[in-house]
Interface confidence: low
């Protein structure tokens, strides 16, 4: 069983009284509706609440909402409703809060059907005063920050208008009409998609896709026949229609759409998707469903120009189009993704990938688990990771995989050990080396939030009773203490930390209930009393990420570099502090097979480093669109990682020769694309 | 109301299959699990496996592997329960019983165990030579 | 798997009474543990959930405690319809089992 409060725990001492001083109780004198929490900047200490209580009427609905607002991380809270002049806030566009530390909050006021427009509440000081703006529109979406310069807001109306405002929603301008989608691209850029005839819904497929550099003085279109886009990392994608049928391809550009290159992807039918699962400036990671209602498509991994793709994995769940998949982003180690496989018998099992897609395993099974009753060999199971998927069915899984960068290696998943996902109750499990190997941390269900850079995991048991119990580790999950935060339990509804988990304050997000009320209730625990000095250099021990073998000297090279990280001790309790910054220590690799993907039309077969030629596509010449030319490419099978800094060593020979054909593609070549002004 | 309607009972030769089916109604079918649990004349009961109805995938105790299909057909609520290699000590009274092993009742969902709370009314498979 | 053993196998107890049933788990269940009342040819009827939850629709005299591995179900005032099998059963990790029963009689 997992370890607990045994003899060879490193115990707290007097953690009782020090976390007793550090608790603060806030009670929301308002009816228990919904209620959300958003913070403001970074390190500000500043904490938004809205509550929302709905009474639907027989004609129309009654709100009421209440905004609340901490400077101290949740441990006290002011009413500052009448700072929006006790306005009904429409909860479904939540809080917009600005970029970075820009202090900047927009709040959408809920407006009577008649009025000619919509009503916003803008604070530009970290909601310490608010403005108030009546909009020349309906908004249809929240606002959306230029993640260049937070002044700059857009937003969509009711009527489809694209509006644009350039002094932080004071003054609104509709630059475009029929507008579907839009994104803020980088340095200021808007694109957007537009139809012609008469409906989003009715044009898809026949879209234009649309790009302005100046906040709408002038436009140029930059695709037509578009049926979605999308940008992730430095790539823009456009899902556009072929032709001759209602299939579609990926086009992919580096260069905000000036020019397109037609990705080397499977097209997709109606009733398929294309998802990007995960994109950063070297390569994305594409999924592409199958034919038919399967629940599952393939994930493809890019190069570098995201053009030419690789089979990653196989049999990817995902369930429908905007529905569930398990593509789980692992951000306490580089090159670690977790996801779902649907397996033949309909079984969902996990897979692990430490090298960016090159090659996925399963789990490794924990040391102390057994195999449950969905192993055929008791002896011989894996590890299975409960994320969007069995939340979406209802399975008793509170909360998804959690990691964050600053906690180096520790991963928090809730899981089930056998053959597959079970639909038994799960238990939490911990990694503290990026997924390599696993520990039970808890049994059971629980929330959980990592503080102070994994100097403290904080955990509470996910529980249809009333609570009044937090457990908390400060040895990365290996030994728990048990804290009662008040003598009065309350139905638990969340934990909130300030996203980063540099913090040493958790707040407790609950509902007390008597006969005819139901109040909302906050309990904000400071640990800062429990690591009670700052960590020195002898807290620290060296650590070598993805190392699997100490003897090989490549040991640790993953994308052909390795890097050493200065670690917190396990046994050591104190700070980290929230200036912490993570150490690392790079070193290049020698080029190995392991430096380089399989090129397209190639494989690796399973425990083999060398990639063979897909037998269906043996003897093709692999010609792909580039530019608008046509390319040959001549390949052994390999091309190296994108993002991969190896030197020396192995170097499969890899050229693109240009036939110099033009293209079919039934996209606009940039010959063809037209500006316009304003 | 909640009801599971289970089919009639059956006679079988050892070696063959038999296929037991659960119709459910009163609920939204894809909202619960199912179990199936058998009792042999005179004897305790023995849950054989479980069935999420949404994906279908399934859950089987070691016993049974091998020998028992559990599938669903959302269309019609309904659940199938096949056991193969029919002998006679597998002559019992077949159950299906909604289980919502892991999913929440209403109100913050829960680690707690809500039981099997509704059962069919069973289905008495005889096997004989 | 996790075995569930009832004791006593057999409980002679007068209308009125109080009757204490016992369910031991081979190892932890923590509160993952129901109870079911059987009466001859009839399934089984789902008495207590999450150890100590009464189900919908049962009387205030059943009561269930316990966690971890030892688990009790308690009737108050045994009333004639009472008399029946009873079975506990752990859901905390697979396969589901069942204890062996206790019948209650009348005595």
């Known amino acids: 069983s997992a370890p607990g409060e045994d003899e060879e725990c490193g115990r707290v001492r007097d953690f009782v009284a020090k976390l007793a001083n550090n608790t603060h109780q806030h009670v929301f004198d308002d009816l228990r509706g919904s209620v959300s929490l958003s913070w403001v900047g970074d390190s500000t200490g500043v904490i938004l609440v809205l509550t929302t209580f709905h009474v639907p009427l027989v004609i129309m609905t009654f709100g009421q909402s209440k905004l609340y607002r901490s400077e101290d991380y949740g441990k006290n809270f002011k009413d500052i409703t009448d700072l929006i002049n006790n306005t009904f806030i429409r909860t479904e566009f939540g809080m917009a809060i600005g970029p970075e530390n820009s202090g900047k909050v927009v709040l959408t006021a809920e407006v009577s059907g008649g009025s000619r427009g919509g009503r916003i509440f803008r604070s530009s000081d970290f909601a310490k005063n608010f403005v108030q703006t009546d909009l020349p529109f309906h908004p249809l979406t929240q606002m959306m920050y230029s993640p260049q310069n937070s002044d700059y807001l857009l937003a969509l109306s009711t009527e489809n208008g694209l509006w644009v405002s350039k002094n932080f929603g004071g003054k609104w301008e509709e630059i475009h009409k029929a507008v579907c989608l839009a994104k803020w691209g980088s340095d200021n850029t808007i694109f957007f998609t537009t139809y012609a005839n008469g409906s989003c819904k009715a044009d898809l497929g026949a879209l234009e896709l649309w790009r302005t550099s100046d906040l709408g003085k002038s436009f140029k279109t930059i695709g037509v026949k578009i049926y979605s886009f999308g940008l992730g990392g430095r790539f823009l994608f456009a899902s556009v229609m072929a032709d001759k049928d209602t299939t579609r391809r990926i086009h992919v550009s580096t260069d905000q759409g000036d020019t397109w290159s037609m990705a080397q992807l499977p097209s997709v039918g109606q009733e398929q998707f294309y998802s990007i699962l995960a994109a950063n400036d070297d390569m994305v990671f594409m999924h592409v469903d199958e034919p038919g209602d399967t629940g599952f498509g393939t994930i493809f991994t890019s190069d570098d120009r995201g053009i030419v793709y690789s089979k990653s994995l196989d049999r990817h769940l995902y369930t429908t189009t905007g529905g569930e998949t398990d593509f789980t982003n692992v951000t306490s180690l580089r090159g670690v993704y977790i996801t779902s496989v649907l397996s033949e018998d309909n079984s969902i099992q996990t897979m692990i990938t430490f090298d960016q897609g090159g090659r996925w395993t399963h789990l490794r099974k924990p040391e102390n688990s057994e195999c449950d009753a969905t192993a055929k060999n008791k002896n011989e199971c894996s590890l299975h990771i409960h994320a969007s998927y069995s939340i979406s069915q209802k399975l008793n899984v509170p909360m998804a995989p959690l990691s964050e960068p600053n906690a180096v290696g520790i991963v928090i998943a809730h899981g089930s050990v056998g053959d597959a996902i079970s639909v038994m109750v799960p238990d939490v499990y911990i990694s503290d080396d990026g997924g390599y190997s696993w520990t039970k941390m808890l049994e059971g269900p629980h929330y959980y939030t990592i503080l102070d850079s994994g100097g403290i995991i904080v955990a509470i048991e996910h529980s249809s009773r009333p609570i009044n119990v937090i457990k908390f580790s400060t040895d990365e999950g290996q030994c728990w203490q048990t804290y009662t935060f008040t003598r009065d339990p309350i139905y638990f509804t969340g934990l909130a930390s300030e996203p980063g988990a540099r913090s040493m304050n958790i707040s407790i997000w609950g509902f007390t209930e008597s006969f005819l009320t139901s109040q909302w209730v906050s309990y904000t625990i400071d640990f800062k009393d429990i690591l009670e000095r700052n960590c020195e250099e002898k807290d620290y021990t060296i650590w070598l990420a993805h190392s699997t073998d100490p003897e090989d000297y490549e040991d640790g090279c993953i994308a052909g570099y390795k890097e050493q990280f200065l670690r917190l001790r396990k046994s050591s309790v104190c700070q980290n502090g929230r200036d912490y910054v993570v150490t690392k220590q790079p070193s290049i690799c020698l080029c190995s097979l392991e430096d380089f993907l399989c090129d397209f039309g190639y494989y690796r077969p399973e425990n083999d480093s060398k990639c063979v030629e897909q037998p269906e596509l043996k003897g093709h010449d692999l010609e792909f669109c580039l530019y608008g030319r046509e390319e040959h490419l001549t390949t052994n099978g390999y091309r190296k990682i994108p993002g991969d800094k190896c030197q020396g060593g192995v170097n499969p020979v890899r050229e693109v020769k240009d036939l110099k054909k033009k293209c079919t593609s039934n996209f606009l070549s940039p010959e063809k694309q037209n500006s316009k002004s304003n | 109301q909640v009801q599971l309607v289970q089919s009639g009972a059956e006679v079988k030769k050892p070696g063959a299959s038999v296929k037991v089916s659960c119709k459910a109604s009163?609920?939204?079918?894809?909202?619960?699990?199912m179990s199936w649990v058998r009792q042999a004349p005179g004897q305790g009961l023995e849950w054989m496996g479980i069935i999420n109805p949404v994906g279908g995938s399934t859950s089987y105790a070691q016993k049974f592997q091998g020998r028992v299909t559990m599938t669903r057909d959302t269309s019609t609520s309904t659940v199938y329960m096949e056991l193969s290699s029919l002998r006679s000590e597998d002559t019992a009274v077949y159950y299906c019983?909604?289980?919502?092993?892991?999913?929440?009742?209403?109100?913050?969902?829960?680690?707690?165990?809500?039981?099997?709370?509704?059962w069919g009314q069973g289905t008495t498979v005889t096997v004989s030579s | 798997e996790i075995v569930m053993t009832q004791s006593p196998a057999t409980l002679s107890v007068s209308p009125g009474e109080r009757a204490t049933l016992s369910c031991r788990a081979s190892?932890?269940?923590?509160?993952?543990l129901a109870w079911y009342q059987q009466k001859p040819g009839q399934a089984p009827r789902l008495l207590i959930y999450g150890a100590s939850t009464r189900a919908t629709g049962i009387p205030a005299r059943f009561s269930g405690s316990g966690s971890g591995t030892e688990f009790t179900l308690t009737i108050s005032s045994l009333q004639s319809e009472d008399f029946a099998v009873y079975y506990c059963q752990q859901a905390r990790l697979g396969p589901w089992t069942f204890g062996g029963g206790t019948k209650v009689e009348i005595k």
């Open positions: 190892q932890s269940v923590s509160s993952n």
């Open positions: 009163g609920y939204t079918f894809t909202s619960r699990y």
């Open positions: 019983a909604r289980d919502p092993s892991g999913i929440a009742a209403a109100g913050p969902a829960s680690r707690y165990y809500y039981g099997m709370d509704v």
